[in-house]
Every structure is written in C-alpha cells, then in structure tokens.
Amino acid sequence: GITQSPKYLFRKEGQNVTLSCEQNLNHDAMYWYRQDPGQGLRLIYYSQIVNDFQKGDIAEGYSVSREKKESFPLTVTSAQKNPTAFYLCASSI
C-alpha cells in the first residue's frame, strides 16, 4: 500500500516541515496534491522515475526529492506563507 505521515502537523512560523510518503507497490509515478477547504485537488509536484520530478500547478514554497522508488517526501518550506491545507500523496504504475 501507500503510507503518508504524519496525519496531523503543526508548523512553527519560519520552519520547514517534511511530509513522508512511502509506497511498496513498485509504482514508478508518485504525486503530491493539496486541497484547500471547498476546493478540488491541486497538483504540487510529481515524479515519474527515481531522481526526476516536475513541478505541478502550485509548486512555489514546496520542495521534493525522489532518492528511491519507494519514497517521495514533500517539504513545506518557510517560503510557503499559507501552508494550512489537506495534503494527499498518490502513486501509479
């Protein structure tokens, strides 16, 4: 399956925080989305192979890495002034 953690996270002003996403499905592609209240999902970043990733529609204030196939952590940087949202990680073949 796919595991995202933590379930809840509080960020102090000026801090970077990292959300973990791990999958054991042997999927090549992984995605991070953000959902704000009353809105649909918006793509932040996606990765289609190890060590390669592309910006989605709202990448500013976020960073990612894809050091291994199973993992695609998302860092919410201090430059992201409005980080409060629901974050969803997904993967696909």
Partner: antibody
C-alpha cells in the same frame, strides 16, 4: 556534498580480472540513487559500464554483461567493479559516478578517475 | 544501442563568438514517461566531465546563462552565446532514456 574516490591497481595483465573500489562520503549508498562506473578510452570516448542501485540491484551495459560485476559493501559505504578476462582494449580511465539530485540519470558527482593499463 | 553522433568533431572559434554543437540520436530519446533524458557535459584535460545541461534544456546549478540546450526527439543542440576563455574544452552529449546509456564522441572546441 557527495564525494567519490576510486582505488585499485593501475596495471592489470591480459586475461586477468580488473578490480576497482569506489568509496563514497557525504551520502549513504543505501539511501538512494544509482552508483555508476563509466570509463574513458585513450581516444577520449566515454562508455557507461553499469550501476548498482540503492537497493542492490544492477543494470549493466550488455556489451560487458558476461564480464562485469558491480557489488557493494554497505558497511564501508563502497561499491566495486570487477571486469574479467581483460584485454588491451580495456585500457582506460575508470570513473565512479552518481547522479545529481533531480536530474534524471544525469551524473555530476564523479571520482577523480583512475587510469588502468592492461599490459603484460 | 542508441548511437549518439555529434557534429562537428572539432571547432575553432574566438572569444565572444556564438557557437552551436549538434547531437543526433539513432532513435527517439523520448521516454515512455514523456521526458527526454538528453544531457550535455563539458570536459577539460585531466578532469572528469561536468554536467552543463540536463533533460535537453535545463541548466545545471552554477552553469552560466550563456549555455543553453534545445531540441526534441532525435535532434539536439548546445549553444554557447558568447564564448569565454574558460569555455575551450571538449563537449559531450549523453542519453539516459535507454539502457545502455550512451555518449556522443565529443566536440573539441579550440581557440582560433
């Protein structure tokens, strides 16, 4: 900052096995990425030989497949190249290399290179 | 294997010149994921190659803006808009779309 350093004999006799080791500092080879061997012939042509992945799996150049083995020693954070049945055509500068984050498979961390001469 | 053919093999130019090096692959370098893994390296004598451009047109960290990459499919170009003295070196294209990864034969850029 990832740093790589090759070590091994500079002279190998024909028909013997070439053995080189790459020591990695600044990053654990089990944490991610692909750990490559690339060689450069005296005429300056570059050849990708193969890699060992963070999970220990391999991908080799088919032109070398019957002769090449890339292995690792995770306790020493090293990966190694063995090339059997060498001939003078294997004389080259051998580099270990790994990709730079976010570039696909484009490598930008390189060892300094070690010259291997195959001669009796 | 994918053959990578660079032209010219050598080139003489002067400081301030605009220089273009081309690289042609024997097959399309578009990956099944729609990305194109074509890269350019610079190598100086006695040193390891250095990454200049990755994925056709992305300048690597610290690479001056006078270097640019373009192209698609099988035909690619590295352009140096205004040659500087430190740019005289050998340039290689490389593909990592298909295994085995392969390199062009190199283009040696010399001072005229």
């Amino acid at each position: 900052q990832v740093q790589l350093q090759e070590s091994g004999p500079g002279l190998v006799k024909p028909s013997e096995t070439l053995s080189l080791t790459c020591t990695v500092s600044g990053y654990s080879i089990t944490s991610g990425y692909f750990w490559n061997w690339i060689r450069q012939f005296p005429g300056k042509g570059l050849e990708w030989m193969g890699y060992i992945s963070y999970d220990g799996s391999n991908n080799y150049n088919p032109s070398l497949k019957s002769r090449i083995t890339i292995s690792r020693d995770t306790s020493k954070n090293q990966f190694s190249l063995k090339l059997s049945s060498v001939t003078a055509a294997d004389t080259a500068v051998y580099y270990c290399a790994s990709p730079s984050p976010g570039t696909g498979y484009a490598v930008d961390y390189w060892g300094q290179g070690t010259t291997v001469t195959v001669s009796s | 294997d994918i053959q990578m053919t660079q032209s010219p093999s050598s080139l003489s130019a002067s400081v301030g010149d605009r220089v273009t090096i081309t690289c042609r692959s024997s097959q399309s370098l578009v990956h099944s994921n729609k990305n194109t893994y074509l890269h350019w390296y610079q190598q100086k004598p006695g040193k390891a190659p250095k990454l200049l451009i990755y994925k056709v047109s992305n300048r690597f960290s610290g690479v001056p803006s006078r270097f640019s990459g373009s192209g698609s499919g099988t035909d690619f170009t590295l352009t140096i808009s205004s040659l500087q003295p430190e740019d005289f070196a050998t340039y290689y294209c490389s593909q990592s779309t298909h295994v085995p990864f392969t390199f062009g034969q190199g283009t040696k850029l010399e001072i005229k």
